[in-house]
């Protein structure tokens, strides 16, 4: 009778084992082992026992001991079980960003690993088991579906294999895949709200505001604002689930015409975009031209108003005839025209909006000087010792300087409160002088002496 020891062995792949073949007869004709494995016989005393070292065991094997004794031939098998952990434990790649509410399929692939009867595949979210299945097939594949929720944001999903050899007196061997970190997001179906001027004047600045509600996580949202090819640099303010991006936009003559204003919000692997057209226009203020801004009284003055070729102008409230970009009026300058404003208002239609521009010029009329009875009375009679204020107003532009002198040496304090004395009495020559000339007027001061009884 042939026997083998040990009859069952579990060993790591590529390992070695000592197998003893024995026979019950003392003088066997033959005693050996049959195996495809590399073997090495260890020398022992006696004829009825042989020890073999079997090496590089790569797979399960059943080496067979045999002996040939006088009473016949017999055999005995030993069962070698090879164990090894999987060579690949991998989650199928997924986009890191997943929209909330989507069904996400997690697929774990396991290559290798033995014995398969002891190999289990576990899908996890963090430390929480989602699914546990035995490894079947090559590669083994385990799948589960997860409904993406907001609170999954930042969660780590992984796949773990468990080779449980504890019943065989060994340990539990675990292999874990690289984690997949899930980024969840909510991007509403509504496009962002874009508030901007519909028209914008060349060489001015406008403000553009793009906003959107119902975003998650709002801090991860990317906002792109652009006017034509010009990328804007917005300042973004975040709320709990909203943002508002505000940018200044400067336009030049090169931008003139219709430009596309875009606001794109990118979150995860989705985007929402709003387009708006902005009309960039050039509309200089109308030009008010006076033949001369400063003229002498009686001069003919032409006032012209010129504006943008497509504008319609009014000059001092009177529309151009015919209605168009030019208007003019003629006048003979009078003192009353001094300081008169000539206002030109131009209106231009841009993208359905009426734009108004004004320009005002002032006419200076040089006239005078004038000294007349109304403003510079020729005669004053005042009681002695009374308080009086001599008044004499010279008119003209520029305002004349006025001097009133008695005997070429005594001034009359115009506009000052004076105590009337005999010295004040007499005839004063008042002279009003400006760059426009000089006029004189005689003013007599009479002083009434108090009567004594």
């Amino acid at each position: 009778q042939t026997s083998v020891s040990p009859s069952k062995v579990i060993l790591p792949r590529g390992g070695s084992v000592l197998v003893t073949c024995s026979t019950s007869c003392d003088q066997p004709k033959l005693l050996g082992i049959e195996t495809p494995l590399p073997k090495k016989e260890l020398l022992l005393p006696g004829n009825n026992r042989k020890v073999y070292e079997l090496s590089n065991v790569q797979e399960d094997s059943q080496p067979m001991c045999y002996s040939n004794c006088p009473d016949g031939q017999s055999t005995a098998k030993t069962f070698l079980t090879v164990y090894w952990t999987p060579e690949r434990v991998e989650l199928a790649p997924l986009p890191s960003w997943q929209p909330v509410g989507k069904n996400l399929t997690l697929r774990c692939q396991v290559e290798g690993g033995a014995p398969r009867a002891n190999l289990t595949v576990v899908l996890l979210r963090g430390e929480k088991e989602l699914k546990r299945e035995p490894a079947v097939g090559e590669p083994a594949e385990v799948t589960t579906t997860v409904l993406v929720r907001r609170d999954h944001h930042g969660a780590n999903f992984s796949c773990r294999t468990e080779l449980d050899l504890r019943p065989q007196g060994l340990e539990l061997f675990e292999n874990t895949s690289a984690p997949y970190q899930l980024q969840t997001f909510v991007l509403p179906a509504t496009p962002p709200q874009l508030v901007s001027p519909r028209v914008l004047e060349v060489d001015t600045q406008g403000t553009v505001v793009c906003s959107l509600d119902g975003l998650f996580p709002v801090s991860e949202a990317q906002v792109h604002l652009a006017l034509g090819d010009q990328r804007l640099n917005p300042t973004v303010t975040y709320g709990n689930d909203s943002f508002s991006a505000k940018a200044s936009v400067s336009v030049t003559a090169e931008d003139e015409g219709t430009q596309r204003l875009t606001c794109a919000v990118i979150l995860g692997n989705q985007s929402q975009e709003t387009l708006q057209t902005v009309t960039i226009y050039s509309f200089p203020a109308p030009n008010v031209i006076l033949t001369k801004p400063e003229v002498s009284e009686g001069t003919e003055v032409t006032v012209k108003c010129e504006a943008h070729p497509r504008a319609k102008v009014t000059l001092n409230g009177v529309p151009a005839q015919p209605l168009g970009p030019r208007a003019q009026l003629l006048l003979k300058a009078t003192p009353e025209d001094n300081g008169r404003s000539f206002s030109c208002s131009a209106t231009l239609e841009v993208a359905g909006q009426l734009i108004h521009k004004n320009q005002t010029r002032e006419l200076r009329v040089l006239y005078g000087p004038r000294l007349d009875e109304r403003d510079c009375p020729g005669n004053w009679t005042w009681p002695e010792n009374s308080q009086q204020t001599p008044m004499c107003q010279a008119w003209g532009n520029p305002l004349p300087e006025l001097k009133c002198l008695k005997d070429g040496t005594f001034p009359l304090p115009i506009g000052e409160s004076v105590t009337v004395t005999r010295d004040l009495e007499g005839t004063y020559l008042c002279r009003a002088r400006s760059t426009q000339g000089e006029v004189t007027r005689k003013v007599t001061v009479n002083v009434l002496s108090p009567r004594y009884e």
């Epitope: 001097k403 070429g408 304090p413």
Partner: antibody, heavy 116, light 110 residues
Amino acid sequence: SVEESGGGLVKPGGTLTLTCTVSGFSLSTHAMGWVRQAPGKGLEYIGIIGSSDRTYYASWAKGRFTISKTSTTVDLKITSPTTEDTATYFCVRDPYDSFDDGYRLWGPGTLVTVSS
Amino acid sequence: AYDMTQTPASVEVAVGGTVTIKCQASQSIYSYLSWYQQKPGQRPKFLIYDASKVASGVPSRFKGSGSGTEFTLTISAVQSDDAATYYCQQAYSSSNVDNAFGGGTEVMVK
């Protein structure tokens, strides 16, 4: 313009007349005055003749000085001068009578030295 | 009498400094006051008239103010060329006058 003449050495108690010749303006519309300045001292107002020929004097100058005029000259007569009358005498167009900065016409002055 | 009192009699000021000269009339002369600058051996030079109007060619550093009986001449950012004697003169009354001029203020620039 305004220019004084007639200054020089005069004996105490004598009589001296200084003449001021004007050009570029009329004495019928302008008053003319006399101011003096003793060596190392301040300016001293003597008096003025108005456009109507009326004269006005500083209180200390009354009786000792006489101002008169023709169509183009203004005279200052000094009666019985003393050594204290030694000074430079300026003829001045009335300080108030003008609109612009071109007035304040002062002559260069004429030096009167009273010495025996 | 319309008489003028000027203070101080003399003042020393550094280049770049400011000097203030006061002139007081014995009774109101309204704004009829002039200021003169005189350098040794020269006739007086007219600076300011009607209390505050600056004569042509006079630097804006010279500023006159006041009315009634109190008047001031202020010279700011003083330059060495400003060393001179300064006089005020009332131009209101030609009669009833002891002296129409102030006593003068000598300005020395160091």
